[in-house]
Amino acid sequence: LPTLPWSVCQEEWGDCLPSDPDLDPVGTITNETKSSAELYFLKTVLQQKDGIEDGLG
């Protein structure tokens, strides 16, 4: 099966926890850590938000 794009942390996302626990065997979760699913969602909606704001400018 192909890996879902939000299942794996991207380097530019900073503190990140893979949403597939098998991809995080060390257990790096902290209070500051967001799952890759959340970060992927945030990244896409922020891009959309930036696009709207740029369009208004």
Partner: nanobody, 117 residues
Framework: QVQLQESGGGVVQTGGSLTLSCKAS???????MAWFRQAPGMEREFVAG????????HYLDSVKGRFTISRDNTKNTLSLQMNSLRPGDTAVYYC???????????WGQGTQVTVSS
Amino acid sequence: QVQLQESGGGVVQTGGSLTLSCKASRRTSGFAMAWFRQAPGMEREFVAGIGRTGDNIHYLDSVKGRFTISRDNTKNTLSLQMNSLRPGDTAVYYCAADVTKSGFIYWGQGTQVTVSS
């Protein structure tokens, strides 16, 4: 400022269904929104998110195909239809609205979902 109020939680048996609702105190059509959950002793985790217009939907891998997020911008409500519930879904479920680079700004008080085996 936006107040968010969740409802629809309860106790359900494994395999059962629940629908959670989140009512906002004012218009939320300009905001992305999401559902999070927190089980006892665990961190709060992202469950599902939805973009401003109902597009751009993402789910936690373990709920994909079982949970459905939706919104009604005319009623300022966010919903989470939860099917095929499992004991591992037991948690307090929170809705959240409006995104910045650090995460969500507005949070509800949460509603308890308990899935018994």
